[in-house]
């Protein structure tokens, strides 16, 4: 492993780390946000940052309800400097191989370089190639959406089925759900799970004459995806007179394996590729986003890219003190490593964003769920928060109880768009939603003490049950509206938050060796399920489970 990007092995070696430990002991753990607001009339002014998108729309990030003061922020910024976060950031944006364990560039940022500035990997300016893929996506999506592209019987396409898993599924699923308001021409379906139910239920609701299948697998060898793709192909052929020539009008590939794509029967003109410097969980910006372009239209897809590009520009050009993703990442480190917080809640107060926490879960946990640093040593500190979330207000009626009164500190991000796409009942729904967005953050901060509880009439043993400790940190993210540009910006914000965390922890946020072992063992066990013999090659538990399964199957 190449550790040429950082000159420290462990974050705990950095002077600012020790300084933060002292600050935590002397003031951090007793800091009262409520009192900080009383002490500093300019606190909100100082600790909220407004991001202006390329189209002039704005997103406000309010960090003022976090467990910080000027001294803590200054020490966190010092930590970022000592960890050389900006150096690693600049190396990433220069196309250097910062994914050291796989010796690859990490260049998803090049996919949204709509300014078309030269961006180099290994001496090659990839901007023209990125632009070319987008032109291909634009031409293809416009043909399909307009009805110019026709199925084998001459009917226009009405449904798109994206078959992929992990990064080839989560991103498009989340984005198409989030931007449903911008759709209308086509219906889109996603099949990811190897569980036959997923593909079977999808095939029940589509018509082979009017369905386009997108097979999303970079290598075209991902077991789940290729199994599902073959099932889809067999279904399609069985419904269309077993004529393989029809496949060309109904299947496209999001892949780079031209040989396997051709073998499958897909016309390689309908192959949309992306390079090895695009990680799966960062691939929604690439050809993997074709289902998004088909669903919301290419112009909206480009606005989505431009929103992310605007955050990239902010991240690379803004001084640390005002750098929004950097501050978000530093706060995460502060809670994780000094307060011992193990989780991070993201609650979108927006039904369209209902898959956003699931998407961020992969982004954050697959990136930073590591325990070995770039210096090839095990960390002696916590990394990778457990990220979870659900849309509010639903979440208020499930796990918010634990956030308010549980024994764990759960730093939370609340997200709201001021303007609803559906301002029904004279904005009544939107006002109720917004009032909860503001109230929850306020309640978590101010809490409710014994005196207030008693004043409200509670007595005896009931009093402690109604007390809220408060001082529970939230970041409020208030957008004007969830547009393609806003969504692109929000995703890029969290990407760079994740990057900042990983840079400080000195881990490689861009590999995922943790997914390999299970895959290998599943292949071995797969063969054992093909015969009727009793299995005894594993531990007693695994043997017992396999044998019982075989008996019941």
């Amino acid at each position: 492993s190449n550790n040429s990007f950082t000159n420290f092995k462990l974050a705990t070696e950095l002077p600012a780390w020790s300084k933060l430990q002292k600050i935590y002991e002397s003031q951090g753990k007793t800091l009262s946000v409520k009192q900080e607001f009383q002490k500093d009339a300019k606190r909100f002014e100082k600790l909220n940052k407004t991001f202006t998108n390329y189209d002039g729309s704005k997103i406000l990030f309010d960090y003022s309800k976090n467990l910080v003061n000027d001294e803590i922020i200054a020490a966190l910024i010092e930590l970022a400097k000592e960890a050389n976060v900006t150096g690693l950031r600049d190396a990433m944006f220069k196309g250097e191989h910062i994914n050291s364990t796989e010796d690859r560039a990490v260049y998803h940022v090049a996919l949204r370089n709509r300014a078309n500035k030269p961006m180099y990997v290994d001496g090659v300016n990839v901007a023209p190639e990125v632009d070319s893929v987008l032109k291909h996506m634009k031409e293809f999506s416009e043909q399909v959406r307009s009805g110019e592209w026709k199925g084998y019987t001459g009917k226009k396409i009405t449904d798109v089925v994206n078959i992929g898993i992990g990064g080839s599924d989560l991103g498009p699923v989340m984005v198409t759900e989030a931007l449903k308001h911008y759709a209308g021409v086509l219906d889109v379906h996603f099949v990811s799970n190897i569980d036959g139910t997923h593909i079977a239920e999808t095939l029940k609701v589509v018509d082979p004459e009017t369905t386009l299948f997108l097979i999303a697998s970079k290598t075209f060898t991902t077991a789940e995806t290729i199994t599902n793709a073959n099932t889809a192909k067999n279904w399609f052929l069985s419904k269309t007179g077993n004529d393989p020539s029809h496949i060309a009008k109904h299947f496209a590939a999001l892949s780079t394996n031209e040989t396997e794509v051709a073998k499958f029967g897909i016309d390689t003109k309908n192959m949309f590729g992306f390079e090895s410097w695009v990680g799966g969980r960062y691939s929604v910006w690439s050809a993997i986003g074709l289902s998004v372009a088909l669903y919301i239209g290419y112009d909206n897809f480009e606005a989505f890219l431009k929103g992310a590009e605007a955050v990239d520009n902010h991240f690379t050009q803004t001084p640390l003190e005002d750098n929004i993703p950097l501050l978000g990442g530093l706060l995460s480190v502060w809670y994780n490593n000094f307060f011992g917080a193990q989780t991070h809640l993201v609650a979108p107060f927006d039904q369209y964003l209902h898959r956003f926490p699931a998407y961020l879960q992969q982004l954050s946990m697959e990136s930073n769920g590591k325990s070995v640093t770039r210096g090839n040593v095990f960390t002696d500190y916590s990394t990778g928060s457990i990220l979870f979330g659900e849309p509010a207000t639903n979440a208020q009626h499930s796990f918010f109880q634990l956030v308010h009164q549980g024994t764990k500190l759960i730093p939370s991000d609340f997200i709201l768009a001021a303007q609803s796409h559906n301002p029904i009942e004279n904005k009544l729904h939107q006002k109720m939603l917004a009032s909860n967005f503001f109230a929850q953050a306020e309640a978590l901060m101010v809490g409710k003490d014994e005196e207030q509880v008693k004043a409200e009439g509670a007595t005896g043993g009931l009093v402690p049950h109604k007390v809220f400790s408060g001082n529970r940190p939230t970041t409020s993210i208030l957008a004007q509206k969830i547009t393609p540009a806003t969504l692109g910006a929000l995703i890029a914000y969290y990407e760079h938050v994740t990057f900042t965390e990983g840079a400080i922890w000195n881990i490689n946020s861009f590999d995922q060796w943790g997914v390999e072992l299970g895959k290998v063992l599943a292949k071995v066990i797969g063969k054992e399920l093909d015969n009727s013999s009793t299995i005894s090659t594993h531990d007693a538990s695994t043997n017992g489970l396999i044998n019982q399964f075989k008996e019941w199957m």
């Epitope: 990839v126 032109k135 780079t256 031209e258 396997e260 390689t268």
Partner: nanobody
Framework: QVQLVESGGGLVRPGGSLRLSCAAS????????MGWYRQAPGKQRELVAT???????NYAVSAKGRFTISRDNANNRVTLQMNSLNSEDTAAYYC???????????WGQGTQVTVSS
């Protein structure tokens, strides 16, 4: 800056062999279908052979059995081995790269092949 630089052309007797080579720079070579085209004086440019990103080859009828195209992704190079040359193979030979995933292509400057006794 993208460059496709051909080499290996020259004068050869009928029945002889030549090996044309094209060195590419400034492109993600492994993502391009590479090809050789030729243009004889007063004629249209025509396909000789192509090789896809996956290594599948395609030859013009006149080249089949005599010419072999190959690629070396590690060194960003494509070669055309030409055997049993005859006077009809006399032409300027051009290296061509076509991006596999979108409308993007580049041409070399060409190298002259003359088959004459």
């Amino acid at each position: 800056q993208v460059q496709l630089v051909e080499s290996g052309g020259g004068l050869v007797r009928p029945g002889g062999s030549l090996r044309l080579s094209c060195a590419a720079s400034g492109i993600t070579f492994s993502s391009y279908t590479m090809g050789w085209y030729r243009q004889a004086p007063g004629k249209q440019r025509e396909l000789v052979a192509t090789i896809t990103t996956g290594g599948s080859t395609n030859y013009a009828v006149s080249a089949k059995g005599r010419f072999t195209i190959s690629r070396d992704n590690a060194n960003n190079r494509v070669t055309l081995q030409m055997n049993s040359l005859n006077s009809e193979d006399t032409a300027a030979y051009y290296c061509h790269s076509r991006f596999a995933y979108g409308p993007l292509e580049y041409w070399g400057q060409g190298t002259q092949v003359t088959v004459s006794s």
